[in-house]
């Protein structure tokens, strides 16, 4: 069964800046990755970025830089300033659409006890 992993890290240099990393463990052709916060995209979450392997990347504030790390993993850096910036207990979700298996998603947040710079 395919799985999705999510890591959330707070940047040591900017305490309200986050890096989200997500990966897909499974076969099939990844068609789309959707990153959201505040819950899954289909359950009240707000889309931060959509990454397509051929047609490019779309991102919305406070997302600063979304990119493919490998063919099956992505990373997203969020801006640390402004009213829409995330807080320490924000939930981030990644949904991988793989053809023809379907969609698989997982969510993660910064562990309450983690220091800046540590991976979730």
């Amino acid at each position: 069964t395919p799985e999705v992993w999510v890591q959330v890290r707070m940047e040591a240099t900017e305490l309200s800046s986050f890096t989200i990393r997500c990966g897909f463990l499974g076969s099939g052709s990844i068609s789309l990755v959707t990153v959201s916060w505040g819950g899954p995209n289909g359950a009240g979450g707000t889309t931060l970025a959509v990454l397509h392997p051929e047609r490019g990347i779309r991102q919305w504030a406070p997302a600063r830089q979304a990119r493919w790390e490998t063919q099956s993993s992505i990373s997203l850096i969020l801006e640390g300033s402004g009213a829409s910036s995330p807080c320490a207990n924000t939930t981030f979700c990644c949904k991988f659409a793989s053809f023809p298996e379907g969609s698989w998603e997982a969510c993660g947040s910064l562990p309450p006890s983690s220091d800046p710079g540590l991976s979730a």
Partner: antibody, heavy 120, light 107 residues
Framework: EVQLVESGGGLVKPGGSLRLSCAAS????????MSWVRQAPGKGLELVSA????????YYPDTVKGRFTISRDNAKNSLYLQMNSLRAEDTAVYYC?????????????WGQGTLVTVSS | EIVMTQSPPTLSLSPGERVTLSCKAS??????VAWYQQKPGQAPRLLIY???NRFTGIPARFSGSGSGTDFTLTISSLQPEDFAVYFC?????????FGQGTKLEIK
């Protein structure tokens, strides 16, 4: 304008074979996953086969597995369905459809359909 | 596989009426739900994707809603051309499955 045009349907005896074709135009065929969906007379819709944009991943339900083979030729903008060991219950209109990644794999374009009748 | 159950199978209505069609999934399908319209002798036509997004050229009287397992398609004021069969579909997990359809007929 996106166009999908099916051909190859007809009357065939039980146990016989048919090869359906779908000619695509008006879009970059190699960038889209494709499927065959059938509809028996007066019935609902059933996915009978799907293929990823590069042709590397395919799907078949148990009802046709081992009898039907989906393939594509991206250089010719064509989708195919080889149907062997046909049964009376395979009688249906067969539609070629395109999946849109950005729409959660919804099928945003359909051909007009080609009728396959399996009868002795 | 995920089973999509539509209700009711048939609805008899008059032009101008508001109608709500129901679709229930046997397990959560996130927001990967689409709705299609099919008229006799024609191929299905995409109306709604991702639960609530209207496809290009679809009139505003069509709207979709729901989450998890319960979804609805609403037509705010039926027009003569809206009498057709409507199918919901989940594209969350393979195999993509369709509901059995709801037929809207003129009363």
């Amino acid at each position: 304008e996106v166009q999908l045009v099916e051909s190859g349907g007809g009357l065939v005896k039980p146990g016989g074979s048919l090869r359906l074709s779908c000619a695509a135009s008006g879009f970059t065929f190699s960038s889209y996953h494709m499927s065959w969906v059938r509809q028996a007379p007066g019935k609902g819709l059933e996915l009978v086969s799907a293929i990823s944009r590069d042709g590397d991943s395919t799907y078949y339900p148990d009802t046709v597995k081992g009898r039907f083979t989906i393939s594509r030729d991206n250089a010719k903008n064509s989708l195919y369905l080889q149907m062997n060991s046909l049964r009376a219950e395979d009688t249906a209109v067969y539609y070629c459809s395109r999946h849109e990644d950005y729409f959660g794999f919804a099928m945003d374009s359909w051909g007009q359909g080609t009728l396959v009748t399996v009868s002795s | 596989e995920i089973v999509m159950t539509q209700s009711p199978p048939t609805l008899s209505l008059s032009p101008g009426e508001r109608v709500t069609l129901s679709c229930k999934a046997s397990q959560s399908v996130s927001n990967d739900v689409a709705w299609y319209q099919q008229k006799p002798g024609q191929a299905p036509r995409l109306l709604i994707y991702y639960v609530s997004n209207r496809f290009t050229g679809i009139p505003a009287r069509f709207s979709g809603s729901g989450s998890g397992t319960d979804f609805t398609l609403t037509i705010s004021s039926l027009q003569p051309e809206d009498f057709a069969v409507y199918f919901c579909q989940q594209a969350y997990r393979s195999p993509w499955t369709f509901g059995q359809g709801t037929k809207l007929e003129i009363k």
